[in-house]
Amino acid sequence: ERLPLTPVSLKVSTNSTRQSLHLQWTVHNLPYHQELKMVFQIQISRIETSNVIWVGNYSTTVKWNQVLHWSWESELPLECATHFVRIKSLVDDAKFPEPNFWSNWSSWEEVSVQDSTGQDILFVFPKDKLVEEGTNVTICYVSRNIQNNVSCYLEGKQIHGEQLDPHVTAFNLNSVPFIRNKGTNIYCEASQGNVSEGMKGIVLFVSKVLEEPKDFSCETEDFKTLHCTWDPGTDTALGWSKQPSQSYTLFESFSGEKKLCTHKNWCNWQITQDSQETYNFTLIAENYLRKRSVNILFNLTHRVYLMNPFSVNFENVNATNAIMTWKVHSIRNNFTYLCQIELHGEGKMMQYNVSIKVNGEYFLSELEPATEYMARVRCADASHFWKWSEWSGQNFTTLEAAPSEAPDVWRIVSLEPGNHTVTLFWKPLSKLHANGKILFYNVVVENLDKPSSSELHSIPAPANSTKLILDRCSYQICVIANNSVGASPASVIVISADPENKEVEEERIAGTEGGFSLSWKPQPGDVIGYVVDWCDHTQDVLGDFQWKNVGPNTTSTVISTDAFRPGVRYDFRIYGLSTKRIACLLEKKTGYSQELAPSDNPHVLVDTLTSHSFTLSWKDYSTESQPGFIQGYHVYLKSKARQCHPRFEKAVLSDGSECCKYKIDNPEEKALIVDNLKPESFYEFFITPFTSAGEGPSATFTKVTTPDEHSSM
């Protein structure tokens, strides 16, 4: 019968920081030089031996004379209570198939971590424990005096625990949060009655959870160095270096090389010249509490991130073409680069791709003259595209070209005795058609009745009009815009010898907020188009003169511009242009984009005052310079009489007072006889014009007293 192999020499040591018990023991009576599979059962009690808190089995192969080791981590800080440990064993080896039985228990080993020294009456544990956010933590207090009432607070809020014995209470903190990097404070206060006997506190260091590095990537720009980057996520550093920021290590499995990175989000790896093409990197993030890693496997030639191109230049720049050249940093022989060119100008962007070896060249065509362009280039590995380099760019300006379009020209012809005064207007060419800076305009005036006679007027830019005094002949006028390169096509208009201002009835039109909608009858015969011109009715024509060209098949147009102002009257003239470029006035129109009420009232004179009547007149009142078409006048009359005079009707004024009102519907009727009056009576009147938008401003009434019947005025 075999002897039971009882564990002996059980020794227990502690690690307060880890809250762990470390057991060491040996097995007696083990046959010399023999190995046996054995099972050890371990029992752990707290406070007293009968209070078993943990039982577990540990299986291992045991050699003769071997010292066995096993560790156990306690949730409760070891300082909080005395622990007891014992152990027994069982042979579980195929070499001994007969029924096996457990050995006796070893004697209990008592484990006590004494940190409750000094004259203090209260202790709180654990000291400066480091845990990860979201974990469960157990803390405790030990009170020397069981008469004391002890309250504990986590960040100032009271917590409640479980009494383990009269001196010890434990608190289970579930899923502890990160509060601050200087730790979470917990303190306990012992008191008798209302008198504090003392307070003890601890700092619990809660670390944020270490994240797996994100976006891990490596690339090379020169086949000498790999530049690896990643997003480290949250920094898990704690105050007072209780836990430094997480460290990052690169490990390459093919070479077996390892490098501790000095930056938190990037690391450089030297490429050895041993033609290693494939790399398998593991990036390991590590803090005191855990490790996280992420892996990438790649071929070096597939991870080329080129340095940006350099020496960007432009050669043979003319008005519409240029050659763009650039250089790339050569990184390997027979390397093909794919380059992308972006051309920005005139609000447009063009993109071109080109394959190159060392030096890049691209022919930029169909450019606009006299235009500043920004061209930039970036390159990548053409064989295994990984990513584009940064851009390299430069500005250049194309040369000027002759203006490509004739100026838009119009005129006003006024008849003077014996001649025509022609005021010529032109619009500046758009940038697209000017092809450079316009320096001057040539105006060529040719007498069609005397073909040999012509005059040239050179007008410096930026002038946009000129006045010509011509006799009663027909004239052809050409306007040409000139820049440093050349002249534009000519714009031609013809002034006929016949007076063009034949009587055309002016028609009133109503505008809208959007502008004016105009239509006209087509001109008989061939026309090459129509011109609508307009200006402010009350101003000098030259100040606000505009025109619009309309095609030959169109007999209506909308004139809309922000320049139209409410209360301003605009005059429109519509001309037909014959094939000989002679303008014929077809229609005249006038109107307001928005009518307003009259801005002033007439100055009224009282005439022929008799005992029974008086005459009101306002002959000087101009209906032309008003902010709307005057439609007539309202005459207001007040008297002591209850009834209104014939033709007058009752009205209520804005101040609520009553009076009599007479309406005149003819704006040119500027007088009124008020009769059927009583002698020696007091009357008040007030006259205001009205437009479609309302009456003129309210004003004071004028007083009139009729004389007695015997007086003569």
């Epitope: 000094g118 004259q119 203090d120 202790f123 709180v124 544990f125 000291k127 400066d128 607070y153 960040e155 100032g156 509060i179 601050r180 200087k182 730790g183 404070n185 303190y187 003392g198 307070m199 003890k200 506190g201 601890i202 700092v203 105050g239 007072w240 209780k242």
Partner: antibody, heavy 126, light 110 residues
Framework: QVQLVQSGAEVKKPGASVKVSCKAS????????INWVRQATGQGLEWMGW????????GYAQKFQGRVTMTRNTSISTAYMEMSSLRSEDTAVYYC???????????????????WGQGTTVTVSS | QSVLTQPPSASGTPGQRVTISCSGS????????VNWYHQLPGTAPKLLIY???KRPSGVPDRFSGSKSGSSASLAISGLQSEDEADYYC???????????FGGGTKLTVL
Amino acid sequence: QVQLVQSGAEVKKPGASVKVSCKASGYTFTSYEINWVRQATGQGLEWMGWMNPNSGYTGYAQKFQGRVTMTRNTSISTAYMEMSSLRSEDTAVYYCARDIVAANTDYYFYYGMDVWGQGTTVTVSS
Amino acid sequence: QSVLTQPPSASGTPGQRVTISCSGSNSNIGSNTVNWYHQLPGTAPKLLIYNINKRPSGVPDRFSGSKSGSSASLAISGLQSEDEADYYCSTWDDSLDGVVFGGGTKLTVL
């Protein structure tokens, strides 16, 4: 009884240094953190920093970083605050004060100051 | 300029209740406990309230503290002439990594 006794008044020239002592009695010196607070005449209280007498660890207010050093001698239960490069605006009463909680830590946590020294007047004048 | 804001002065008549406010931010009062001190002329400050509303031994229950969000207040009921002193609020500031005080409130008993 529990008390903190500070060294006597000092008069210093601008640019000089001063070292103020604070002797603890009536309690276990290493169990409670020591704070230093100053108060200029007619002004409010200004915290300067802390020292853990057990570990010797210190922490200073940003304003005093590099100019103040807090030390201790546990064998005589005394804390010290030394301030260099003195200026006229450093003229104040300097207090040492014990934290109300005996914190089982090598570091620091502020719970409040329940025992104060009598104060040391430091005058900086040329 | 103090990190915590207190009214410079407060007053009351004997027997009255007086409240002194202390306002801060999320990094100080908003996330830490508050202490109150009082200081008689020519003496060291004395702790009056710790952990928002706890009184050390010897402090009468006429003194009480409270906190709401980023503000705290000290209430003194049954005002007495010996309560005439300077009152300071204090807390830890997570951003500044240090203890901060209010500018102080001078309490006058009329």
